[in-house]
Interface confidence: medium
């Protein structure tokens, strides 16, 4: 990895061991203020592998609300608007970081947690082996 | 929202105002030890809207490495394996939380940051406006 010289103005920290507890400012800096407005917008409806979005809420987690994608069909939508079962709609999943209140119900103490979320769906060709 | 009684065993915190600084244990708890094997595997290659994965590294960020998807084509791959420009390959994007070292180069002080990442691509029908 890259070694970075430590800033002398850093807050003091007693515990230098990993796993370590760090200070985190929850005043979120959003680097996406001017992001592409074409984002995922209505792709969920216009995709050949359309999906529905489901609300996943957990007050012990930060962020407490995460939207999960669930593919609408097993197959993909063809040019005629019908489901083609020779193709497969599959979820694109990603591991993301969230903060989990620890101990539970504590407003100022968290633990980093990795969770898997389905972000949307894509249409793939199935894996098929033909007998010679 | 749901009001949760505060756990009496919580660490003390002087600043009760938001934005607040909280304690976060960086020993990540991974809830995905045995996740669905159907994950994103080789979908990036088999999708009708295939994508490439690019490494985005930033030592001032946690996690320092994030993989970004970039759609390979403007159009989508049809049944003959050719690019069909009547359809569009578009990135599925998601806002995720990361930790940004603040002040810079500090090992134990962070600020939450939202960044937009492209997770994969999906094939959509283009929006076409017809002149009346």
């Amino acid at each position: 990895g890259i070694t970075i010289p430590r800033n002398p103005g850093c807050p003091n920290s007693e515990d230098k061991n990993f796993p370590r507890t760090v200070m985190v400012n929850l005043n979120i800096h959003n680097r996406n203020t001017n992001t592409n407005p074409k984002r995922s917008s209505d792709y969920y409806n216009r995709s050949t592998s359309p999906w529905n979005l489901h609300r996943n809420e957990d007050p012990e987690r930060y962020p407490s609300v995460i939207w999960e994608a669930k593919c609408r069909h097993l197959g993909c939508i063809n040019a005629d608007g019908n489901v083609d079962y020779h193709m497969n709609s599959v979820p694109i999943q990603q591991e993301i970081l969230v903060l989990r209140r620890e101990p539970p119900h504590c407003p100022n103490s968290f633990r980093l947690e990795k969770i898997l979320v389905s972000v949307g769906c894509t249409c793939v060709t199935p894996i098929v082996h033909h007998v010679a | 929202g749901i009001t949760i009684p505060r756990n009496p065993g919580c660490p003390n915190s002087e600043d009760k105002n938001f934005p607040r600084t909280v304690m976060v244990n960086l020993n990540i708890h991974n809830r995905n030890t045995n996740t669905n094997p159907k994950r994103s595997s080789d979908y990036y290659n088999r999708s009708t809207s295939p994508w490439n994965l690019h490494r985005n590294e930033d030592p001032e960020r946690y996690p320092s490495v994030i993989w970004e998807a970039k759609c390979r084509h403007l159009g989508c791959i049809n049944a003959d394996g050719n690019v069909d420009y009547h359809m569009n390959s578009v990135p599925i994007q998601q806002e995720i939380l990361v930790l940004r070292r603040e002040p810079p180069h500090c090992p134990n002080s962070f600020r939450l940051e939202k960044i937009l990442v492209s997770v994969g691509c999906t094939c959509v029908t283009p929006i076409v406006h017809h002149v009346a």
Epitope: N88, I127 | R31
Partner: antibody
Framework: EVQLLESGGGVVQPGRSLRLSCAAS????????MHWVRQAPGKGLEWVAV????????YYADSVKGRFTISRDNSKNTLYLEMNSLRPEDTAVYYC?????????????????WGQGTTVTVSS | QSVLTQPPSASGTPGQTVSISCSGR????????VDWYQQVPGAAPKLLMY???IRPSGVPDRFSGSQSGTSASLAISGLQSEDEADYYC???????????FGSGTKVTVLG
């Protein structure tokens, strides 16, 4: 006709081993994920393990993890379940079952073909 | 204890409609699709429904499935004596890293 035929069951003492086989016919075995599911006497269905169409991915129930091994020989159209350190609670009818769609599906199309089952009794 | 909860039993007279619920959580039904199986005594299970609500060929349209949030349900309309069996819901669970079955529901056709 699509068919699955289990064999290898029997009576075995605790701590011993047993190997179950499942012979597949009537479909392209190498295209499909395969499961083992068991059912203890008078109880419900319990999932045991799954293997991907090419054998590259294997997943197990916590109750058998580290003791049971699922494998397949696509050239012989046969699925296996190697059971070690058997316990009385492993006593059950063991079924092999085929995933309903080819490729990297493990469950989305359900388990559409089941064998008739083979009985495993673990007793001293 | 199964992570998918079903009522132990359900009953109805011929012609009636019987519904069976299957309650799970976000890591299973909330994210994945539900399968339903029918098992008559002494026989292997039979796939009755997949992808929440799709019937395999040969399954009568008296059987229907639905899913909402972290719950799913199977409805049998126009109940017939041959519907007397055990019914199991099942799906993948990301937390457990495996396929999970419900506790099972015994359907009895009365009279």
């Amino acid at each position: 006709e699509v068919q699955l035929l289990e064999s290898g069951g029997g009576v075995v003492q605790p701590g011993r081993s047993l190997r179950l086989s499942c012979a597949a016919s009537g479909f392209i075995f190498s295209n499909y994920g395969m499961h083992w599911v068991r059912q203890a006497p008078g109880k419900g269905l319990e999932w045991v393990a799954v293997i991907s169409y090419d054998g590259s991915n294997k997943y197990y129930a916590d109750s058998v993890k580290g003791r049971f091994t699922i494998s397949r020989d696509n050239s012989k159209n046969t699925l296996y379940l190697e059971m070690n350190s058997l316990r009385p609670e492993d006593t059950a009818v063991y079924y092999c079952a085929k995933v309903g769609a080819s490729g990297d599906y493990y469950y989305s199309y359900g388990l559409d073909v089941w064998g008739q089952g083979t009985t495993v009794t673990v007793s001293s | 204890q199964s992570v998918l909860t079903q009522p132990p039993s359900a009953s109805g007279t011929p012609g009636q409609t019987v519904s069976i619920s299957c309650s799970g959580r976000q890591s299973n039904i909330g994210r994945h699709y539900v399968d339903w199986y029918q098992q008559v005594p002494g026989a292997a299970p039979k796939l009755l429904m997949y992808y929440d609500s799709i019937r395999p060929s040969g399954v009568p349209d008296r059987f229907s499935g639905s899913q909402s949030g972290t719950s799913a349900s199977l409805a049998i309309s126009g109940l017939q004596s041959e519907d007397e069996a055990d019914y199991y819901c099942a799906t993948w669970d990301d937390s457990l890293g495996g396929y999970v079955f419900g506790s099972g529901t015994k359907v009895t056709v009365l009279g």
